[in-house]
């Protein structure tokens, strides 16, 4: 039977909903709401899941939020902020969504899909 | 539109075989983890077993392990359940069911079912 | 192994509130989903992350989970919503689905 199915496709999912939101966006994403800038190093997956969980009542990000869960071990709630390591800068949604995606295709282009 | 249709159930005599097939269409099946649910006729929901979009990983029910194997075909957009030493207890509706993304896919949601199969294991 | 134990049945009036509740061993640690299944028909999710809808659910659903005990709260009541509700969670490699409770609209 076929072999594993390697993990780029799972990244690719999620940096192509990032490429859908971002060429999408008309009025500012989810009213122009902040969140904690993150290091996108280690970790970079639960942290930004954290960050954004604490959005509400945004529907272009919901299946953001819900696809950075299928990355992160454990579950993530509002508010907690485990992951997040130091929270001293907030940047607007449709900038935190920006970085994330450089960052995402960055690793993509290098083959680091874990 | 996301879409997943099961064949293959059937009547089959207590200790035999059955193959089923889940053809999946409108999303990119080989990102997505698939998973097998059963219910047996006036009972609940019961997980059968998971196949991981990510890596490859199989994932069981105790009350199936050692007998059911879960595999995938991704050129084909398929996804099987090999059933073999089947009891009486196995009769149900098995159902295909769209999983999560990544490597922990569970904490996604089961958000695609198809309308299911019946099985049916009676002498 | 790991259980979720739901009330068998539930009865609501129309227009009132129907409360379902899912019971496992620091539930609130996992994430819980919700899926409701009318008679010959396959299950649909209603409720993820504990709490999330997705798109097409009605607002009238809405689900919370902390402690041992996920609840699933249907408000204003219809006729339609009337079918077995069943939570599940994800615990040592395995999907758990709760026993399913059978929420009956009166009237």
């Known amino acids: 039977s076929p072999g594993p199915v390697p993990p780029s496709t799972a990244l690719r999912e999620l940096i192509e909903e990032l490429v859908n939101i971002t060429q999408n966006q008309k009025a500012p994403l989810c009213n122009g709401s902040m969140v904690w800038s993150i290091n996108l190093t280690a970790g970079m997956y639960c942290a930004a899941l954290e960050s954004l969980i604490n959005v509400s009542g945004c529907s272009a990000i919901e299946k953001t939020q819900r696809m950075l869960s299928g990355f992160c071990p454990h579950k993530v709630s509002a508010g907690q902020f485990s992951s997040l390591h130091v929270r001293d800068t907030k940047i607007e949604v449709a900038q935190f969504v920006k970085d994330l995606l450089l960052h995402l295709k960055k690793l993509f282009r290098e083959g680091r899909f874990n | 539109e996301v879409q997943l249709l099961e064949s293959g159930g059937g009547l089959v005599q207590p200790g035999g075989s059955l193959r089923l097939s889940c053809a999946a269409s409108?999303?990119?099946?080989?990102?997505?983890?698939m998973s097998w649910v059963r219910q047996a006729p006036g009972k609940g929901l019961e997980w059968v077993s998971a196949?991981?979009?990510?890596?490859?990983?199989?994932y069981y029910a105790d009350s199936v392990k050692g007998r059911f194997t879960i595999s995938r075909d991704n050129s084909k957009n398929t996804l099987y359940l090999q059933m073999n030493s089947l009891r009486a207890e196995d009769t149900a509706v098995y159902y295909c069911?769209?999983?999560?993304?990544?490597?922990?896919?569970?904490?996604?949601?089961?958000?695609?079912w198809g309308q299911g199969t019946t099985v049916t294991v009676s002498s | 192994s790991y259980e979720l134990t739901q009330p068998p049945s539930v009865s609501v009036s129309p227009g009132q509130t129907a409360s379902i509740t899912c019971s496992g061993d620091?539930?609130?640690?996992?994430?819980t989903c919700w899926f409701q299944q009318k008679p010959g028909q396959s299950p649909v999710l209603v409720i993820y992350?504990?709490?999330k809808r997705p798109s097409g659910i009605p607002e009238r659903f809405s689900g919370s989970n902390s402690g041992d005990t996920a609840t699933l709260t249907i408000s204003g009541t219809q006729a339609m919503d009337e079918a077995d509700y069943y939570c599940?969670?994800?615990?040592?490699?395995?999907?758990?689905f709760g026993t399913g409770t059978k929420v009956t609209v009166l009237g």
């Open positions: 069911v769209q999983d999560g993304l990544g490597p922990y896919f569970y904490n996604y949601g089961m958000d695609v």
């Open positions: 409108g999303f990119t099946f080989s990102s997505y983890a």
């Open positions: 196949f991981s979009g990510s890596g490859g990983s199989t």
């Open positions: 620091k539930l609130g640690d996992k994430y």
């Open positions: 992350h504990d709490s």
């Open positions: 599940q969670a994800w615990d040592s490699s395995t999907y758990v």
